[in-house]
């Protein structure tokens, strides 16, 4: 026996109250597959959230961060503040990274300057706060009297950050 | 959509090697870090360590250094987790999860038994 | 590194208030974040960065977080919260992040 509620479209719900006939979704609310006994209530984009997409009576809306956020979890659940490069996050706002560690993204925190010295490299460019060192060839491969820059450079353990 | 797959269920032997795996899609891989997380049986989360992909730079905490090694692959995607030698004290699922202090996603969990 | 303390276990009446505290030394010089876990599942976050509720979280979950402790508030608590909840921290001393033990809640 077929359930009389299979029938009733996306966009639809199966009214127990009236004798199972299939009624619209009510404002704010959405059915997205057929069948179903209930519309789910529309998601709402407040506070640093705002609307992709509106809500329809078939599916629901999306979300995503106002500009200075960006979106983390499913369906952009949750928004986290983005800060420069060359920053980190902390609970007091956006931190310059401390020497020795860079960040060249809007997001995440700051990590440590490479250590050519470990790989028997020497220093071809110095880090900053936006980007890493890079590494050149070994001090043994240069020829004489050429000079490469070579700062003291932290070995590649997480350092203290500012907070 | 964004996943992290991790790979299957192991039983292992006292003293072998392990290498699980966890596969990351539907975003830029290189540029989140990805944690692993210990889960004992009946027990709580403990937090191991992480990894930035785009550099493989890691860090681990205290409790798991030198016990085991994390390290990553962008070009495929997949970081891995690593032992040398396992104990019957490594029995327990361990998942990986995209981030440093908000996971927002988590691998399915893999399994690991050691036992003789 | 920091420690993170939680009651092994909360009890609460169907449409009561359960609340499971998290302390730590200065944990409120940090964000605390909250997850649920339920049997055979990973966990999932129900509160981030002391207070904030990603979405299709129910409203009934709140976070606040000052001095030393952190607490998850689950207000009109319902049978389908029951669950492991753990808070969590990120530390810039040492770049680690920490679990708290966890606390089982148990709906009556």
């Known amino acids: 026996l077929q359930d009389p509620c299979s029938k009733c479209p996306a966009g639809t719900f199966c009214d127990n109250n009236r004798n199972q006939i299939c009624s619209p979704c009510p404002p704010n609310s959405f059915s997205s597959t057929s069948g179903q006994k209930a519309c789910d209530i529309c998601r709402q984009c407040k506070g640093v959230f705002r609307t992709r997409k509106e809500c329809s009576s078939t599916s629901n809306a999306e979300c995503d961060c106002t500009p200075g956020f960006h979106c983390l979890g499913a369906g952009c659940s949750m928004c986290e503040q983005d800060c420069k490069q060359g920053q980190e996050l902390t609970k007091k706002g956006c931190k310059d990274c401390c020497f020795g560690t860079f960040n060249d993204q809007k997001r995440g925190i700051c990590r440590p300057w490479t250590n050519c010295s470990l790989d028997g490299k020497s220093v071809l460019v110095n880090g900053t706060k936006e980007r890493d060192v890079v590494c050149g060839p070994s001090p043994a491969d240069l020829s004489p009297g050429a000079s490469s820059v070579t700062p003291p450079a932290p070995a590649r353990e997480p350092g203290h950050s500012p907070q | 959509q964004v996943q992290l797959v991790q790979s299957g269920a192991e039983v292992k032997k006292p003293g072998e090697s392990l290498k699980i795996s966890c596969k990351g899609s539907g975003y830029s891989f290189s540029t989140y870090w990805i944690s692993w997380v210990r889960q004992m049986p009946g027990k709580g989360l403990e937090w191991m360590g992480k990894i930035y992909p785009g550099d493989s730079y890691t860090n681990y905490s205290p409790s798991f250094q030198g016990q085991v090694t994390i390290s990553a692959d962008k070009s495929i995607s997949t970081a891995y987790l690593q032992w040398s030698s396992l104990k019957a004290s490594d029995t327990a699922m361990y998942y990986c999860?995209?981030?440093?202090?908000?996971?927002?996603?988590w691998g399915q969990g893999t399994l690991v038994t050691v036992s003789s | 590194d920091i420690e993170l303390t939680q009651p092994p276990s909360v009890s609460v009446a169907p449409g009561q208030t359960a609340r499971i505290s998290c302390s730590g030394d200065n944990i409120g010089d940090q964000y605390a974040h909250w997850y649920q876990q339920k049997p055979g599942q990973a966990p999932v976050v129900v509160i981030y960065q002391d207070k904030n509720r990603p979405s299709g979280i129910p409203e009934r979950f709140s976070g606040s977080n000052s001095g030393n402790t952190a607490t998850l508030t689950i207000s009109g608590t319902q049978a389908e919260d029951e669950a492991d909840y753990y808070c969590?921290?990120?530390?810039?001393?040492?770049?680690?992040?920490?679990f708290g033990g966890g606390t089982k809640l148990t709906v009556l």
């Open positions: 999860a995209r981030g440093y202090g908000i996971f927002d996603y």
């Open positions: 969590s921290t990120y530390t810039f001393v040492g770049f680690t992040t920490v």
